[in-house]
């Protein structure tokens, strides 16, 4: 699997992670910090 | 699956000003980014703007910066666009089509025809 | 403001032929470019991402290369539903398309 780090266009749209680019899949994805979860890092659980 | 449907095609004087819908299905827009793209007759595609539906932030092309507003409902999951001050030269199909998760533009509406006429 | 100038404008071939399309950026995209297929009435098919990836299904006539700023798009065989107008997207800073290079068969 091809991964890469995001264009700069996507600068924020994971909130609490680091976005990566999933090449061969064609999709951003979001790994998120610890203590945060959701599609896009939005979410804080204890 | 990924379904985005547009509002219906509109006739608009000069001047006016129109709104066009676009209502995701299968995924939900605060996940995603959701664009705009225009293409008028004989001419090329345009990108317009986008919105970020989980802040409500927008980026807009230059050209259309002041004309345009990009909203989104997301407790309807829907992303509108409007366009003001028309003339003959916004005549056009506007398509929605869903970033963020997809880096580039894989999923789109079906496109609206806009036209502007006297 | 990222301007992406594509070349031809359009160009007629045969079926067979092979058939060669560049986009160049007015700055580095860093092999942030799309290639897209529109037909009248449909919207925009992607077929290549990151200058080169093929996108799933799309056939593997359709071929992308380059970096930087020069970029190329090329169709290995060209096949009577290739006929389309066809346009590159930068999405490195916002979204850029090219103007479009409309093929048609000779």
């Known amino acids: 699997v091809s991964i890469t780090k995001c264009s700069s266009d996507m600068n924020g749209y994971c909130l609490h992670g680091q976005c990566i680019y999933l090449v061969d899949m064609s999709q951003n994805y979001c790994r998120c910090e610890v203590g945060y979860t959701g599609v896009r890092c939005e979410h804080f659980f204890l | 699956q990924v379904q985005l449907q547009q509002s219906g095609a509109e006739v608009k004087k000069p001047g006016a000003s129109v709104k066009v819908s676009c209502k995701a299905s299968g995924f939900n827009i605060k996940d995603t980014y959701m664009h705009w793209v225009r293409q008028a007759p004989e001419q090329g595609l345009e990108w317009m703007g986008r919105i970020d539906p989980l802040n409500d932030k927008t980026k807009y092309d230059p050209k259309f910066q002041g004309r345009v507003t990009i909203t989104a409902d997301t407790s309807t999951n829907t992303a509108y666009l409007e366009l003001s001050s028309l003339t003959s030269e916004d005549t056009a199909v506007y398509y929605c089509?869903?970033?963020?998760?997809?880096?580039?533009?894989?999923?789109w509406g079906q496109g609206t025809l806009v036209t502007v006429s006297a | 403001d990222i301007q992406m100038t594509q070349s031809p404008s359009s160009l007629s071939a045969s079926v067979g032929d092979r058939v060669t399309i560049t986009c160049k950026a007015s700055q580095d995209i860093n092999k942030y470019l799309a290639w897209y297929q529109h037909k009248p009435g449909q919207a925009p098919r992607l077929l290549i991402h990151?200058?080169?990836t093929l996108h799933p299904g799309i056939p593997s006539r359709f071929s992308g290369s380059g970096s930087g700023t020069d970029f190329t798009f090329s169709i290995s065989s060209l096949q009577p539903e290739d006929i389309a107008t066809y346009y590159c997207l930068q999405y490195d800073n916002l979204r850029t398309f090219g103007g479009g290079t409309k093929v048609e068969i000779k």
């Open positions: 990151y200058t080169s």
């Open positions: 089509a869903r970033g963020g998760g997809d880096p580039v533009f894989v999923y």
